[in-house]
């Protein structure tokens, strides 16, 4: 039901301290709708890198994509791989590092084009959430303004939050990602209390706005862990 979908609203985990990579959202949707496969988050550093299994790009960090580690390898065995830099070969946008996109099989800079009319090579479905400016930690390169006729309004498809107008973020919405409002003070948010605690969020909320954090509502402290209500509150 819609209510159960709405109640599962969540935002992917917050970015780690500066220098760490964005965490992985939890899991992938199976071919049978409604079945969630549990997974976990990982914070990746150069010193401590472990291959992270995945099924979709959305499960990987902002500078990664999901693919088989060997060329022509078993599609059933996929891990998060480092994104491809400019002039490297690609099959889709998600393979290219932020600030680039996949054109004719090559990662090219987004700001090398004026993007007149519709540009075909775009991914609206890599459901990962990008906290591009959250808490001042920029994880993605802001794309050139030349790329857009206008910023996406609420309800329009997006790839990352920089595609959306001010006050909106790019969040998962079923099979796609669309621009949704950044949460305001008092609005309900979801805080994942431990790694791996969340399944795939098919209907995802944005993060709390500037100066706000997702914290347990004061009058809900006595509630059980599973029913605790989190809201966006002033720091």
């Amino acid at each position: 039901t819609l209510n159960s979908v709405l109640n599962s609203n969540a935002i992917k985990n917050l970015p780690p301290p500066l220098g760490g990579a964005a965490g992985h959202p939890g899991s992938a949707v199976s071919a049978a709708p409604g079945i969630l496969y549990p997974g976990g988050n990982k914070y990746q550093t150069i010193d401590n890198y472990q291959p992270y299994p995945c099924a979709e790009d959305e499960e990987c960090g902002t500078d990664e994509y999901c693919a088989s580690p060997t060329r022509g390898g078993d599609a059933g065995v996929q891990i998060c791989l480092a994104c491809r830099k400019r002039r490297k070969r690609c099959m889709r946008h998600a393979m290219c590092c932020p600030g680039n996109y996949c054109k004719n099989g090559i990662c090219v800079s987004s700001d090398q084009n004026n993007f007149r009319g519709e540009i075909e090579e775009t991914i609206t479905e890599s459901f990962g959430n990008d906290h591009s400016t959250l808490d001042g930690y920029s994880r993605r390169t802001t794309l050139s303004s030349k790329m857009y006729h206008s910023k996406g309004q609420e309800g329009s498809v997006c790839l990352r939050s920089s595609d959306c107008a001010t006050g909106l973020c790019c969040a998962r919405h079923f099979w796609s990602k669309i621009c949704k409002p950044v949460l305001k003070e008092g609005q309900v948010c979801t805080k994942h209390r431990r790694k791996g605690s969340h399944g795939l969020e098919i209907f995802q909320r944005c993060y709390c706005g500037e100066g706000l954090s997702c914290r347990i509502q004061k009058d809900h402290h006595q509630a059980s862990n599973s029913s605790r209500l989190h809201t966006c509150q002033r720091h």
């Epitope: 979709e56 075909e120 609206t124 890599s126 006729h149 309800g155 621009c179």
Partner: antibody
Framework: QVQLVESGGGLVQPGGSLRLSCAAS????????LHWVRQAPGKGLEWVSS????????YYADSVKGRFTISRDNSKNTLYLQMNSLRAEDTAVYYC?????????????????WGQGTLVTVSS | DIQMTQSPSSLSASVGDRVTITCRAS??????LNWYQQKPGKAPKLLIG???SLQSGVPSRFSGSGSGTDFTLTISSLQPEDFATYYC?????????FGQGTKVEIK
């Protein structure tokens, strides 16, 4: 030019199977989520199924769940709908549709581009 | 499921008329609503995205408004090529659901 061309429709008996295909061209197929929407003769539009760009996430209408399977082959730029245990009420024109892009002018929306459809008739 | 109720189900109008079609959702859907035009034997064509965003190539006589549960598609001055059936689609909740359609006929 975005083009979506459905095929595979035809006459089939109740309980039978059909596999619809949607051949895509004019855009990088693997970058988009795709959908099947149907329209019974003289009736309105009904969403059937959706699949994410990578193919791992699939969604179905209750009316077809367990009978229909959506899939895609990104290497062939083709979307499929395997339809089993067909019923008379599945008779319809089946359209494949594609979402818009954040690089459209203005930024795009879901179910933005549609094929011309293929007719499936389930009758004894 | 979210039900979408379109009204009227059909209307007769003349060229130059101002035409208004409404779509009501059974619960709030914010602005997650598209409007489509469909002509006989043809595929639907997206006119308006997210309640009010006119799509590229669509004449400016078409406009959309509304948020929450009530939405309106307006054709400011009906042209001969506008006689068709119009559908709304909500994509706020799963499953996506269409209105039953409004057929705009020549008076």
């Amino acid at each position: 030019q975005v083009q979506l061309v459905e095929s595979g429709g035809g006459l089939v008996q109740p309980g039978g199977s059909l596999r619809l295909s949607c051949a895509a061209s004019g855009f990088t197929f693997s970058n988009y989520g795709l959908h099947w929407v149907r329209q019974a003769p003289g009736k309105g539009l009904e969403w059937v199924s959706s699949i994410s760009y990578y193919g791992s996430s699939t969604y179905y209408a209750d009316s077809v769940k367990g009978r229909f399977t959506i899939s895609r082959d990104n290497s062939k730029n083709t979307l499929y709908l395997q339809m089993n245990s067909l019923r008379a009420e599945d008779t319809a024109v089946y359209y494949c549709a594609r979402d818009g892009s954040h690089m459209d002018k203005p930024p795009g929306y879901v179910f933005a581009f549609w094929g011309q459809g293929t007719l499936v008739t389930v009758s004894s | 499921d979210i039900q979408m109720t379109q009204s009227p189900s059909s209307l007769s109008a003349s060229v130059g008329d101002r035409v208004t079609i409404t779509c009501r959702a059974s619960q709030g859907i914010k602005n997650y609503l598209n409007w489509y035009q469909q002509k006989p034997g043809k595929a639907p064509k997206l006119l308006i995205g997210a309640a009010s965003s006119l799509q590229s190539g669509v004449p400016s006589r078409f406009s959309g408004s509304g948020s929450g549960t009530d939405f309106t598609l307006t054709i400011s001055s009906l042209q001969p090529e506008d006689f068709a059936t119009y559908y709304c689609l909500q994509y706020y909740g799963m499953p996506p659901t269409f209105g039953q359609g409004t057929k705009v006929e020549i008076k």
